[in-house]
Interface confidence: low
């Protein structure tokens, strides 16, 4: 059979080369002389020439030693052709598997590995993992299977077997109790990796195990009592820095302090954070303090570490007395945001509302008012009473200043304290609609055919709100109803414009009057382009080229030629003779009734 089983060839073969591997043989060689060839990477494509075949015998040859670590498998194709070059067999798969030799030793991925473990941990605690790799095969052979071991440990305190290494994973673990950072802060292990699962070549590296500090000292406040003065109303104000000492390793989790307010802050006015460099507790205001409500706060602050205590330790507490200093406070509008309904278009001088502020201070201070932001300039405010009046025309439909029927104004109140303070309020005027806009059709330009015209549907928009909108009514004015009809649909929100008499191709003004539910009327001129066409149209087509009939093709061509000649002559005549005054558009259009065939030539 024209089949070859996979061929296994060891890497680094000594030869002699070329070395015979296997013979390709086609049973078609009884009928004709067969020539054999091979193709594929390793034969005729890179790396070329590793394999060859004896053309006439079919012996597959290896020309040089193989390196499994470069290429582990070659996939070639065997071919058999007759003397005339005709293929006598389908290409045959030839798989050459390169088998491994132990020609690489293990290599640690680092010269020095670093790991750490807490002092006092129990035996069995994992410290770190080291890795060595071997380029040889570890699946079908032991050549690339690495076994790990510890060769030596320095120092040998409290004894020389403090650690063990898992022979296959390289995980280093604690094997004995007694790790004490204060006595031995670091161990150096010489580790080995040996291939052939421990029976082959060996390589070494160093594993440094750092013994980490356990939290066996509590932080202590120095001093334990603090007193501070803070102005009222200030948020984020630094009240006090609290200092602690800790005997554990500086900048470690066992040394870094964590502060908590454990008493005296029922109103949740304060917060305490740890300063990243000094390890101090920074006490700040989370909310503004109110002198009028409480002029002194006594806080109790507790300190622990980022790491939990390793042994039972007492927790230190400090006392902070906070005195609140009185300051002049800004007036506060009541409410801070006021919603008022007012009809649009009210007369100038008409009152809108009264908007006043209260002063939180205990003294009776005088408050004066003014408008801070009035984008359209529609309002004025009495400085003493806070009375807001209209000085311009409030327009609900003004899209530049009004959003969702609301006009937003910002007002200011100022007290007469020393120094004076100000507060702001927001006035939201909800503008009530009046029927001050008539309905408008959209679009205001249409294009329509003068034969079998499609009805033009125009949308009706009215800037006012219901009930000052639909249903709408439509009426044609200025004799537009002679040629056109206008009807409002059942829903009353669109108007349908139809051509009822034939008009020649031209542009016409259609006078359309629309009125809303409140009888507010609006006259709009629609620009109608009438085209010589049937049915639907976007833009007017070119001039007509003959009758409606479908005559013979010869007659059609002659007709076109005649039309073109007439058009050229007509063009010259038009240039020479001055044009006659055109008749009124509608008069001229009335000559032919709608539905007739329009045969005028529009040169």
């Amino acid at each position: 059979d024209w089949v070859v089983a996979p061929i296994s060839v060891p890497e680094n073969g000594k030869g002699p080369f070329p070395q015979r591997l296997n013979q390709l043989k086609s049973n078609k060689d009884r009928d004709t002389k067969i020539f054999y060839s091979i193709t594929g990477p390793g034969a005729d494509s890179p790396p070329e020439g590793v394999f060859a075949v004896e053309k006439e015998t079919g012996w597959l040859l290896l020309n040089k030693p193989l390196d499994r670590e470069e290429i582990a498998k070659y996939e070639l194709f065997g071919h058999a052709v007759s003397e005339n070059g005709a293929s006598v067999e389908d290409p045959m798969n030839i798989s050459i598997i390169v088998t491994d030799q132990n020609d690489h030793k293990p290599k640690f991925t680092q010269d020095t590995f670093r790991g750490s473990v807490l002092e006092g941990v129990l035996p069995g605690t994992s410290v770190m993992q080291v890795t060595a790799t071997d380029e040889d095969d570890a699946i079908y052979t032991y050549n690339g299977v690495v076994a790990y071991s510890i060769h030596s440990q320095e120092p040998k305190d409290p004894h020389d077997l403090m650690f063990t290494i898992h022979r296959s994973t390289g995980t280093i673990s604690v094997i004995s109790s007694g790790l004490d950072r204060e006595k031995v802060p670091e161990y150096t292990l010489t580790i080995q990796a040996t291939d052939m699962d421990g029976d082959g070549s060996t390589t070494t590296a160093v594993a440094v195990v750092e013994i980490l500090d356990a939290n066996d000292n509590a932080p202590m406040f120095e001093p334990q009592k603090y007193e501070a003065w803070v102005p009222e109303n200030e948020v984020g104000h630094e009240v006090q820095r609290l200092t602690v000492t800790d005997l554990d390793v500086p900048n470690s989790p066992a040394w870094r302090a964590t502060y908590h307010i454990v008493g005296g802050d029922d109103g949740d006015h304060f917060t305490i954070t740890t300063h990243p460099e000094t390890n101090q507790g920074v006490l700040t205001t989370k909310k503004g303090l109110d002198f009028e409500a409480q002029d002194q706060h006594t806080l109790y602050v507790e300190v622990t570490n980022e790491a939990p205590f390793a042994v039972k330790l007492p927790t230190a507490t400090a006392t902070v007395v906070v005195h609140v200093k009185d300051v002049n406070e800004a007036p506060v509008f009541v409410p801070p945001s006021k919603v008022v309904e007012v009809q649009e278009g009210i007369p100038t001088g008409e009152p809108v509302c009264v908007y006043t502020a209260e002063d939180p201070d205990k003294e009776n201070q005088k408050i004066s008012y003014r408008i801070l932001r009035d984008p359209a300039g529609w309002l004025a405010m009495d400085p003493d009473s806070g009375q807001v009046t209209a000085v311009g025309t409030l327009d609900r439909e003004d899209e530049q200043f009004v959003r969702n029927n609301i006009y937003e104004v910002m007002v200011l109140a100022m007290d007469n304290g020393s120094p004076p303070t100000t507060g702001t309020g927001t006035l939201l005027l909800t503008l009530i609609d009046v029927n001050d806009h008539g309905p408008v059709p959209e679009p205001r330009q249409i294009t329509i055919c003068n034969q079998s015209p499609v009805r033009q549907v125009l949308n009706i928009t009215d800037k006012d709100l219901s009930p000052h909108t639909s249903p709408f009514q439509a009426q044609l004015t200025d004799d537009s109803d002679i040629y056109w009809t206008a009807e409002v649909n059942e829903e009353g929100d669109t108007v349908v414009l139809s051509l009822k008499k034939f008009l020649k191709q031209d542009t016409y003004d259609v006078h359309l009057s629309l009125s809303d539910h409140g009888n507010k009327e609006q006259l709009t001129v629609i620009r109608a382009t009438v085209c010589d066409c049937h049915g639907h149209v976007e833009t007017c087509p070119g001039p007509w080229k003959g009758g409606s009939g479908g005559g013979g093709s010869g007659a059609g061509v002659i007709a076109v030629i005649v039309v073109v000649v007439i058009a050229i002559v007509a063009g010259i005549v038009v240039l020479v003779i001055s044009r006659k005054k055109r008749m009124a558009k509608y008069e001229k259009a009335e000559i032919k009734e709608m539905g007739e065939m329009h045969r005028e030539l529009n040169a």
Epitope: S45, K107, D111, T133
Partner: antibody, heavy 121, light 107 residues
């Protein structure tokens, strides 16, 4: 910070040899391959070969066998390349470049600044 | 020997544009292809290895893709510092061949 520092420019006569160096710092020199790459003026990059300083294992591009010899000194974290029997074709900038692992997984991530070798009589 | 065809040989683009450079190989190298940028008078800088892994410190506007014999490097929103020569490199089989390079110039 990983650094690969190369020796200065060399002007050598045809037929002579030159040895250029590459000093590494900031990483495990012994367990990373050091590659050497050639670049002729205005041309592309050509891989010469690589050395594993841990045990001196080398791999060469066939084109440079007999031309380049790669060595390494672990104690000084320095890799060397000697170019012999120089001709004008050897005039180029030679870069050394670290390869983080000795398998196929990694490319050359830290490069020296290059050493210019000019062969002229 | 493994053949590498890098295209285009040169490319002109403006800051903010997106460009793509391709690298075609004569045989399968799986995903083991790297991309480097070399500015005039400087050493090459590793951008991408293993076809699509960004090297440390390389901005995310660079992205590599492909496997087998067809690879590409895409640079989104070109910055002034992105101009220079770009090389692809096989880091699978010996010898570690480089592409002929693509010169990316400012338009």
């Amino acid at each position: 910070v990983q650094l690969v520092e190369q020796s200065g420019a060399e002007l050598v006569k045809p037929g002579a040899s030159v040895k250029i160096s590459c000093k590494a710092s900031g990483y495990a020199f012994s367990s990373s391959w050091m590659n050497w790459v050639k670049q002729r003026p205005g041309k592309g990059l050509e891989w010469i070969g690589r050395i594993y300083p841990g045990d001196g294992e080398t791999k060469y591009n066939g084109k440079f066998k007999g031309k380049a010899t790669l060595t390494a000194d672990k104690s000084s974290s320095t890799a060397y390349m000697q170019l012999s029997t120089l001709t004008s074709e050897d005039s180029a900038v030679y870069f050394c470049a670290r390869q983080r692992d000795y398998g196929a997984l990694y490319a050359m991530d830290y490069w020296g600044q290059g050493t210019s070798v000019t062969v002229s009589s | 020997e493994l053949q590498m065809t890098q295209s285009p040989a040169s490319l002109s683009a403006s800051v903010g544009e997106t460009v793509t450079i391709t690298c075609r190989l004569s045989e399968n190298i799986y995903s083991y292809l790297a991309w480097y940028r070399q500015k005039e008078g400087e050493s090459p800088q590793l951008l991408v290895y293993n076809s699509k892994t960004l090297a440390e410190g390389v901005p995310s506007r660079f992205s590599g893709s492909g496997s087998g014999t067809q690879f590409s490097l895409k640079i989104n929103s070109l910055q002034p510092e992105d101009f220079g020569n770009y090389y692809c490199q096989n880091h699978y089989g010996f010898p570690f061949t480089f592409g002929a390079g693509t010169k990316l110039e400012i338009k």
